[in-house]
Interface confidence: medium
């Protein structure tokens, strides 16, 4: 017989020879990182027809790492379904908890023993320190020292000492989030008051009032013979200025060579699209917890 078969999990005991006599026996042992479980044979014999009797390495099993339990308030997931060396164990924490330690352990071979690459991690409860205090305002649960995951606080503004109220700029409600930080920056309480918007040769058609506070919205149209240069809708923004700027009503030219803009009485529609649903002096209704303040 020629050289005996080779296997992934099993190796020849002794040096192989180029040829073997009929009836000659060779023995195998499990390779490093594998261990033998009887009863399958680990030897073969050179048969009379010059072939080796059937033999397999199915009795050699990969070394296994010790079983690791799910961490408290988390889960250990085997990436490839077994604890054999080469395995990966992934750790995740339940909602409201964060991982301390490595999120993946590897089953490695040290000498002939399969061991994990490190200590299993822990899942600790997500906690936040109290949210920021704000000038001219307060938040709920101000006496609480530690907040748990998803605990929320609501900010409100104090009554103003003068005639104009404080407006809340930003998110009124923030919550303790994934990485032990608050979901948004604390809002600001300040007096936001825009100047009375005067449009010569035009008139206000909505948003009437003597005072214009945060998010106050005013709409205009021009007198007959004038067209609107700018937006027909303006909003009082947090820096006490109108956005977009107060428009102008310009006279429609009667010169036969000049083509005036085709328009209704209020002039061409602006391309600027104002925010939806505003109410003076309050946060936009389209802002709430989980939203982006930087939009």
């Amino acid at each position: 017989c020629e050289a005996p078969p080779t296997f992934e999990a099993m190796e020849l005991i002794g040096k192989p020879k180029p040829y073997y006599r009929v009836g000659e026996r060779v023995d195998y042992k499990c390779k490093k990182g594998y261990f033998y479980i009887p009863p399958l044979a680990t030897h073969t014999i050179c048969d009379r027809n010059h072939t080796w009797l059937p033999v397999s390495d199915e009795g050699c099993y990969r070394e296994m790492c010790p079983h690791i339990r799910d961490p408290l308030n988390g889960e250990a997931i085997l990436a490839n379904g077994s604890y054999e060396f080469g395995a990966e164990l992934h750790f995740i924490c339940n909602e409201g908890y964060y991982l301390i330690g490595k999120d993946i352990l590897y089953c490695e071979l040290k000498d002939t023993v399969a061991i994990w690459s490190g200590k299993p991690p822990l899942c600790e409860k997500i906690l936040c320190t109290p949210p920021p205090k704000i000038k001219n305002g307060k938040h709920t649960f101000s006496e609480v020292e530690v907040f748990e995951y998803l605990d929320a606080v609501t900010y409100s503004c104090d009554p103003a000492p003068g005639p104009d109220p404080f407006s809340l700029i930003g998110e009124s409600m923030i919550y303790c989030g994934n990485n032990s930080t608050w979901s948004h920056a604390a809002p600001e309480c300040k007096v936001v008051k825009c100047r009375f918007p005067v449009v010569e040769n035009g008139k206000q058609i909505s948003g009437f009032g003597k005072k214009f506070y945060y998010k106050a919205t005013v709409m205009f149209e021009c007198d007959k013979g004038y067209y609107l240069n700018g937006s027909d809708k303006i909003v009082c923004e947090s820096n006490s200025t109108w956005d977009p700027p107060v428009p102008k009503c310009l006279k429609v030219s009667t010169s036969p060579t000049t083509k005036s803009p085709t328009s209704s009485a209020s002039g061409p529609r602006p391309t600027y699209k104002p925010p939806v649903s505003n109410y003076p002096g309050y946060p936009k209704p389209d802002e709430g917890i989980l939203n982006n303040l930087d939009d």
Epitope: E148, M173, G177, I289, N291, N292, D295
Partner: antibody, heavy 116, light 109 residues
């Protein structure tokens, strides 16, 4: 025009899956938290799921946890609700809604009927 | 069974004032979380009516007002009109969950 246009409803057998879509126009979905709310025939409103503006936080009602997945495709400005292992009690009109603590813009709703 | 409790129905004659109550607990309304109200006209999607306890979005008539005290909130409608006939829902928040009341059907007699 600021609006939410919904699609994807229909009749489906128990145990099967369905995906609802909600296309936004007039604003960008990845600047806002987006929710799904449902209403069973003749019943009240029930909150289903929310995805935060950055997509990092997703919360679900206990009744759908592990079966429904909320997601967003920013390039299409569209919100999705993947509904697996559907049950008869999931039969409802499903609304998508914009906003965080409250919902200031709603889709028109799409009917999902789970029946054998 | 809803976590926020509303009366199933209320009614009033045109021009009258009606109120709809919404009772929660110390873990939602009583914890300081805002209460919001939605109006749902027959066959349509809900519409935001009141946000943050007592604020009206633009376009909502000042006949509608909201208030909150302790673990309860209420919606008041003055000068009742035929077009106010609808279902009304209160809503609030508790850790990781948005809550709705069971809804109240308002009938204008």
């Amino acid at each position: 025009q600021v609006q939410l246009v919904q699609s994807g409803g229909g009749v489906v057998q128990p145990g099967r899956s369905l995906r609802l879509a909600c296309a936004a126009s007039g604003f960008t979905v990845n600047n806002y938290a987006m929710h799904w709310v449902r209403q069973a025939p003749g019943k009240g409103l029930e909150w289903v799921a929310v995805i935060s503006y950055d997509g990092n936080n997703k919360y679900y009602a206990d009744s759908v946890k592990g079966r429904f997945t909320i997601s967003r495709d920013n390039s299409k400005n569209t919100l999705y609700l993947q509904m697996n292992s559907l049950r008869a009690e999931d039969t409802a009109v499903y609304y998508c809604a914009k906003g965080g603590g409250y919902f200031d813009l709603w889709g028109r709703g799409t009917l999902v009927t789970v029946s054998s | 069974q809803s976590v926020l409790t509303q009366p199933p129905s209320v009614s009033g004659a045109p021009g009258q004032r009606v109120t709809i109550s919404c009772t929660g607990s110390s873990s939602n309304i009583g914890a300081g979380y805002d209460v919001h109200w939605y109006q749902q006209l027959p066959g349509t999607a809900p519409k935001l009516l009141i946000y943050g306890d007592n604020n009206r979005p633009s376009g909502v008539p000042d006949r509608f007002s909201g208030s909150k005290s302790g673990t309860s909130a209420s919606l008041a409608i003055t000068g009742l009109q035929a077009e106010d006939e609808a279902d009304y829902y209160c809503s609030s928040y508790t850790s990781g969950t948005w809550l709705f009341g069971g809804g109240t059907k308002l009938t204008v007699l």
